[in-house]
Interface confidence: low
């Protein structure tokens, strides 16, 4: 621990002012972790009088740092820069003269104290000002700078021309794209002081590249990827007094695909999950054995999670019989393309044989079955099983349904006995 | 003043591959996107893509991928555009265009180069 | 891809006469919140390069006679030249730089 400071594993206080320290506290290679230490108490200490670049950059836990009574002048734009669990800093009568916001902005800062500091009047504390005027009243502070007279005056009282905040506006195409395609965004920053502008574009994945020119910018996007969908890009202007951006948001078409597809879980109901991804939102249809499947109440799609461009959800069977056994394909669609895949499923095995070894049916009725005009069409008042029988549908002018003669004095079935009176005898 | 200055007219064979220099002047070349145009004769013009001089990132119109390649030497301020596998249909005049106001419209083009693909 | 439709494809005018012609997109090249249009004007002279004449839609390149209006918004453009002169003699392109850049077709004017 450095002579006239005292260290915990979480803290270290240097407040003697005999012999006093000359530089920010550091820790010995081999004693407390840093990145342990969570507050920093420093008071006292008039022969400190600069935070270096890498002074505090160890201190990754920082959470409270206090120098107060102490002989702090100048504190490096890049002091900070490691310290993102920063959230009280206390630099109470010290001898700062001037303070930029560019230490701070990455911070997520509960408290600045700065109270008792000779600061000058001039545009580079013009955001403190600002800072002040955004806190609620309990929390401001007395904070005054020295005029061209070298008097005290309020910081809320302080008039700087031409020292004001930025604005940006961006200027985008219609920032909804096809995926691989490219776009350009334009912005245009202002404000005196002339602010500088850049760009956040947060995690996009895309390759992307800006062109800066004093107060325009170009943010090029190329090989547009679908994972860059719903993402907020921003054109921020910052100068001395503080910032202004103006967001825009990436709408990113792309073909259909199905992520995943699995076998029947049981729960409430059966449920073949599966997960799609696609923008604009697919449109999905299933097959069964190679047919159309018609949805009804009994058997029908349900989105259950929608997650921007992906879409989770089941195939919804009410109580299935052997009868549903057999391949289930989802087709999914888009005017980007689709993607089709499969499925074996197996509910049950037919009552009394083993459906394994022995999977041939008595006699069986047919049901006549209409390709629906509507794709996820749930509000078909027919309520058809599928028919597994594969080869019996190959070369029929209508798709028909099959249902065991076995099954019909069944109450738990796909079919209803108003329904019967539909069905004919083959 | 801004030029850009392409070279000159070329006669090759089908099959071959061409590459057409843009030198630019009167402005920093790495300050705006080049762009390449087709014109076919007594057509309209097509084009072919962009490049960042900066990074060489391009931009392509899909009809022209695998076609054209575009490339930029800083040093030289001279922007370039190869066209490979050539057949009598990419006989045209090429133009280089620069890329103003974020590449939304094209400044200053350059004289043209003529290209005639024949045997 | 957006397409560019330009009409007529061909004009004939005397000279000091008001001349018209049309440019159509496929798909609505406004911005709304700006409310930019991406589409540009060239010229293109007999034996030379295009020369830009209109950008965002209606905004006259430096150097470009007042002659020359573009108006339009969305998918719907028009080149006026209120009063042609012999050195108008040229083919006049639009094209977009929404999504990327097409050209259209082009329209020839010629002088009586």
């Known amino acids: 621990c450095p002579t006239s400071c005292k260290c915990s594993s979480a803290r270290i206080w240097c407040t003697e002012p005999s012999p006093g320290i000359v530089a920010f506290p550091r820790l010995e290679p081999n004693s407390v972790d840093p990145e342990n230490i969570t507050e920093i108490l420093i008071a006292n200490q008039k022969r400190l009088e600069i935070i270096n670049e890498d002074d505090v950059e160890a201190y990754v836990g920082l959470r409270n740092l206090t120098i107060v009574d102490s002989g702090l002048k100048f504190v490096a734009y890049k002091a900070f820069l490691k310290n993102s669990n920063l959230r009280h800093i206390n630099f109470t009568r010290n001898k700062l003269t001037s303070l930029s916001r560019r230490h701070f902005r990455h911070l997520d800062l509960s408290d600045l104290i700065l109270t008792g500091n000779p600061f000058t009047c001039s545009c580079d504390i013009m955001w403190l000002k600002t800072l002040q005027e955004t806190k609620s009243s309990p929390d401001t502070q007395d904070l005054y700078c020295l005029n061209e007279s070298s008097k005290n005056m309020p910081l809320a009282n302080l008039q700087i021309p031409n020292c004001g905040l930025p604005s940006a506006r961006l200027a985008a195409p219609n920032l909804t794209v096809e995926e691989g395609k490219s776009v350009t965004l334009s912005c245009s920053v202002g404000g005196d002081p002339l602010p500088t502008l850049y760009w956040d574009v947060g995690n996009l994945v895309s390759k992307h590249m800006n062109e800066t020119s004093h107060t325009q910018g170009s943010l090029r996007i190329t090989n547009i990827s679908s994972d860059d969908s719903g993402k907020q890009i921003s054109c921020v202007a910052e100068n001395l007094v503080g910032e202004d951006q103006d967001s825009v948001n990436l709408t990113v078409h792309f073909a259909p695909t199905i992520t995943f597809l699995e076998s029947p879980t049981s729960d409430h109901h059966w449920c073949i999950p599966f997960t799609v991804r696609g923008n604009p939102k697919p449109a999905l249809q299933w097959f069964y054995n190679g047919a159309i499947l018609n949805e009804s109440k009994y058997i029908c799609t349900k989105i259950h999670v929608t997650n921007h461009t992906e879409y989770h959800g089941c195939l919804q069977l009410d109580n299935p019989t052997h009868m549903n056994n057999g391949d289930y394909t989802l087709m999914a669609k888009n005017e980007y393309g689709k993607d089709e895949r499969q499925i074996s499923a197996h509910f049950m095995g037919r009552p009394g044989v083993d459906y394994e070894t022995n999977p041939n049916y008595p006699e069986v009725l047919y049901e006549d079955w209409t390709t629906p005009t509507d794709i996820g069409d749930t509000t078909n008042k027919s309520n058809e099983i599928p028919s597994t029988d594969v080869a019996d549908q190959s070369n029929r002018e209508h798709e028909q349904k099959l249902i065991s003669e076995e099954d019909l004095g069944g109450e738990q079935k796909l079919i209803s006995e108003e329904d019967l009176h539909h069905h004919h005898h083959h | 003043e801004v030029q850009l200055q392409q070279s000159g007219p070329e006669l090759v064979k089908p099959g071959a591959s061409v590459k057409i220099s843009c030198k630019a002047s009167g402005y920093t070349l790495t300050d705006y996107y080049m762009n390449w145009v087709k014109q076919s004769h007594g057509k309209s013009l097509e084009w072919i893509g962009d490049?960042?001089?900066?990074?060489?990132?391009?931009s392509y119109n899909q009809k022209f991928k695998g076609k054209a390649t575009l490339t930029v030497d800083k040093s030289s301020s001279t922007a370039y555009m190869e066209l490979r596998s050539l057949t009598s249909e990419d006989s045209a005049v090429y133009y280089c265009?620069?890329?103003?106001?974020?590449?939304?419209?094209?400044?200053?083009w350059g004289q043209g180069t003529t290209l005639t693909v024949s045997s | 891809d957006i397409v560019m439709s330009q009409s007529p494809s061909s004009l004939a005018v005397s000279a000091g006469e008001k001349v018209t012609m049309s440019c159509k997109s496929s798909?609505?090249?406004?911005?709304?919140?700006?409310?930019?249009?991406?589409l540009a004007w060239y010229q293109q002279k007999p034996g030379q390069s295009p020369k830009l004449l209109i950008y965002w839609a209606s905004t006259r390149e430096s150097g470009v006679p007042d002659r020359f209006t573009g108006s339009g918004s969305g998918t719907d453009f028009t080149l006026t030249i209120s009063s042609v002169q012999a050195e108008d003699l040229a083919v006049y392109y639009c094209?977009?730089?929404?999504?990327?850049?097409?050209f259209g077709s082009g329209t020839q004017l010629e002088i009586k």
């Open positions: 094209k977009q730089s929404y999504i990327l850049f097409t």
């Open positions: 265009a620069r890329g103003a106001y974020y590449s939304n419209y094209f400044d200053y």
């Open positions: 798909q609505s090249l406004l911005n709304s919140r700006t409310r930019k249009n991406y």
């Open positions: 490049i960042n001089p900066n990074n060489g990132g391009t």
